[in-house]
């Protein structure tokens, strides 16, 4: 599965755990993977592509997310969420675009 | 209470302009993806255009693209729909809606809040 | 773009059915669908948003659901104020998509 549609749907899905469940846990389970998988870089066009678009700012979100871990203060999720909704309508937009 | 209120339509010749506002409140048009979306006369719902303002991104229905401009003012909280080279095919009733994924707990975008409508007539 | 295949086109039913309308996207959309109800000469108001997400204030008697990419609305019991057109919606990716709509008459 392309990167896009990976993320795509993972953050859909975190998001649904976190703002209609709380569920936090289930969130990092969701957003942790697709964390790893940019980490480990990209091996195609594609995800070279997808990496330059994005990985700045997803790298941004994933930072403020871990910081809430440490700090426990909401608002540091809060912003966390606000960039990869960011991202998240940015892929939404770019898909159509291209296919 | 949100509210969406859409202005500026009316009678136009075919290759004219127009230019379409939706004035909001109730919420902030800044962090809201805002969408135009059209119905002819006794057709179903098309849309038209979104704009989602905290990161300038816009997106347009094939049929409208290089001809219709959506922009935002978020100092007045009002949305724009410029239409240009208008033809008789776009005649319909023009409404704004928004989608707020706070509200939603979800990304995928469903419009919750829409204004009244306003006509727009393309005809010589 | 993706497309979304609403049917019926219409239908005619009575106070108290239960009544079941689909919408079939070309292509995979998640759970990105909205269904909303449409009265002559008024905007579309939201009914259900992410497939089966009841949006406040509506009618528990409006139920959503997703088998893969056939997407259905379920009205439980007619009421005299459900006689209108609704429409599915995906926005899974742009551009965004309407349904075509199925007008809900009286018997």
């Known amino acids: 599965i392309l990167w896009h549609e990976q993320w795509h749907e993972g953050l859909e899905e975190a998001s649904r755990l976190y703002f209609g469940d709380r569920n936090v846990k289930g969130m990092f389970e969701i957003l942790e993977p697709l964390h790893a998988m940019l980490e480990r870089g990209p091996q195609t066009l594609k995800e070279t592509s997808f990496s330059q678009a994005y990985g700045r700012e997803l790298t941004e979100a994933y930072e403020w997310s871990q910081r809430y871990k440490t700090s426990a203060v909401v608002m540091d999720l809060d912003r966390a969420w606000d960039i990869y909704y960011h991202v998240f309508q940015k892929i939404s937009r770019h898909h159509h675009h291209h296919h | 209470e949100v509210q969406l209120v859409e202005s500026g339509g009316g009678l136009v010749q075919p290759g004219g302009s127009l230019r379409l506002s939706c004035a909001a409140s109730?919420?902030?048009?800044?962090?809201?993806?805002i969408h135009w979306v059209r119905q002819a006369p006794g057709k179903g719902l098309e849309w038209v255009a979104s704009?989602?303002?905290?990161?300038?991104?816009?997106s347009y229905a094939d049929s409208v693209k290089g001809r219709f401009t959506i922009s935002a003012d978020t100092s007045k909280n009002t949305a724009y729909l410029q239409m240009n080279s208008l033809r008789a095919e776009d005649t319909a009733v023009y409404y704004c809606?928004?989608?707020?994924?706070?509200?939603?707990?979800?990304?995928?975008?469903?419009?919750?809040?829409w204004g009244q409508g306003t006509l727009v007539t393309v005809s010589s | 773009d993706i497309q979304m295949t609403q049917s019926p086109s219409s239908l005619s039913a009575s106070v108290g059915d239960r009544v079941t309308i689909t919408c079939r996207a070309s292509?995979?959309?998640?759970?990105?669908v909205a269904w909303y109800q449409q009265k002559p000469g008024k905007a579309p108001k939201l009914l259900i948003y992410?497939?089966?997400s009841l949006y406040s204030g509506v009618p528990s008697r409006f139920s959503g659901s997703r088998s893969g990419t056939d997407f259905t609305l379920t009205i439980s019991s007619l009421q005299p104020e459900d006689f209108a057109t609704y429409y599915c919606?995906?926005?899974?990716?742009?551009?965004?998509?309407f349904g075509q709509g199925t007008k809900v008459e009286i018997k």
């Open positions: 809606a928004r989608f707020d994924w706070y509200q939603r707990y979800s990304f995928y975008e469903a419009m919750d809040y």
């Open positions: 109730g919420f902030n048009v800044y962090s809201s993806s």
């Open positions: 704009i989602y303002s905290y990161s300038s991104s816009t």
């Open positions: 292509q995979s959309v998640s759970s990105a």
């Open positions: 992410s497939a089966s």
């Open positions: 919606q995906q926005s899974y990716f742009y551009p965004v998509t």
